[in-house]
C-alpha cells in the first residue's frame, strides 16, 4: 500500500491524543534505554509503511501485536485517513488476528514496540534530517 495520500495531520493528532499513550502503557516497566532503535524511516509515507509492517506482520519471537489497543487504533487511523487502505489491508490483518492464539508479551514484542515508538516519533518530526 502507498501511504503518500494519507491525511498525515489527522493521523498525527490520533497518535498524540491516544496511540502514544497505549504504546507507553504496553512498555510500562521497561527502561527507555533497554532497546536500541534499529528501524528507521525517512519521511511520513515511509514511516507509515514501517509502522504498518511492525504492527501487523508477525515476526520471529513476536507472533502478532494486532490485538493490542495501540494496533487497533493504528488500524482505525489508517483506515479512515488513508484512502484505499481498508480494501487492500484490512482483510489481511483480520486473517492474522484470527490465526493468533494467546496474548503473550515477550521480550521480542517489547523490543518491537520500542521500535514502533521510535518510528512514530520520527513520523511526528518529518522535517528533521536523518541521523
Amino acid at each position: 500500500y502507498d501511504f503518500t495520500n494519507c491525511d498525515f495531520e489527522k493521523i498525527k493528532a490520533a497518535y498524540l491524543s491516544t496511540i502514544s499513550k497505549d504504546l507507553i502503557t504496553y512498555m510500562s516497566g521497561t527502561k527507555s534505554t533497554e532497546f536500541n532503535n534499529t528501524v528507521s524511516c525517512s519521511n511520513r509515507p515511509h514511516c507509515l509503511t514501517e509502522i504498518q509492517s511492525l504492527t501487523f506482520n508477525p515476526t520471529a519471537g513476536c507472533a502478532s501485536l494486532a490485538k493490542e489497543m495501540f494496533a487497533m487504533k493504528t488500524k482505525a487511523a489508517l483506515a479512515i485517513w488513508c484512502p484505499g487502505y481498508s480494501e487492500t489491508q484490512i482483510n489481511a490483518t483480520q486473517a492474522m488476528k484470527k490465526r493468533r492464539k494467546r496474548k503473550v508479551t515477550t521480550n521480542k514484542c517489547l523490543e518491537q514496540v520500542s521500535q514502533l515508538q521510535g518510528l512514530w516519533r520520527r513520523f511526528n518530526r518529518p522535517l528533521l534530517k536523518q541521523q
Epitope: N5, C6, D7, K10, A13, A14, S17, T18, M72, K73, K75, A76, A77, A79, I80, W81, C82, P83, G84, S86, E87, I90
Partner: antibody, heavy 120, light 111 residues
Framework: QVQLVQSGAEVKKPGSSVKVSCKAS????????ISWVRQAPGQGLEWLGV????????NYAEKFQGRVTITADTSTSTAYMELSSLRSEDTAVYYC?????????????WGQGTLVTVSS | QSALTQPPSASGSPGQSVTISCTGS?????????VSWYQQHPGKAPKLMIY???KRPSGVPDRFSGSKSGNTASLTVSGLQAEDEADYYC???????????FGGGTKLTVL
Amino acid sequence: QVQLVQSGAEVKKPGSSVKVSCKASGFTFGSYGISWVRQAPGQGLEWLGVIIPLLGVPNYAEKFQGRVTITADTSTSTAYMELSSLRSEDTAVYYCARGAEYFYWYFDLWGQGTLVTVSS
Amino acid sequence: QSALTQPPSASGSPGQSVTISCTGSNSDIGGYNRVSWYQQHPGKAPKLMIYEISKRPSGVPDRFSGSKSGNTASLTVSGLQAEDEADYYCSSYAGTDTFVLFGGGTKLTVL
C-alpha cells in the same frame, strides 16, 4: 439489540446551539465510525462529520467546519453532535449513523433521527 | 446542489425493472470503489441497500443490484414490488477531506 437511540426533538432560536446525543448498544462502540447526517424538510441527505470513538479525532465536512463539534464518550457508548450559530436553514432531521468497522464511509445502522427546528 | 447527480424521479410497473443512475467525478465515484445506496421510506431513517458498488447487506433482496462504470454508478431494482416505492440515495466516498457525498435522491414510484 443492535441500535442507535437519539435524543428528542429540539426547538432553538437563531444564533443559539443545539447538542444531539446518540447512544449505541449491542455492538463494540469504539472501533466503528459514528457519522452525523442531516435532512432538511423535503430535501436530500447531507453529511456533517464523523468520529471514531476509539481515536477521538473528528472529521468535519468543510461546509460545517467551525460550526459543528462531534465528540464521543466510550464509557457510555454515546456520541454527540453540537451545531452552533443556528439559522433557519439548519432546521432538519439529524441522524447519527454507524459506519462499518474500518469501512467508515457506508452506514449500516441509523438512529431514529432528531428533529431540530430553528425558529424565532 | 448535490455533488452527485441523480434523476429526481423514476417509475415502473410491478414486476418490471428500473435503473437509477448516480453521476459524480474522478474525485469520488470514479476514484474509489466506495459507492453505496440507501432506501428511505417517508418518515423513516435511511436503510443501506448496496455497499462497495455491488455488495448487498444480509436481508436485502437480490432484486437489488449495483454497478459502476467510470464516474457513474447505477442501482437496478428488478421485479418491482409495491414496497420498493421510496426515495433512493446514492453515496460515495470522496477522499479524506470531503469524506462522504450524497446524491440528491430519486423518488421511485411503482405504478
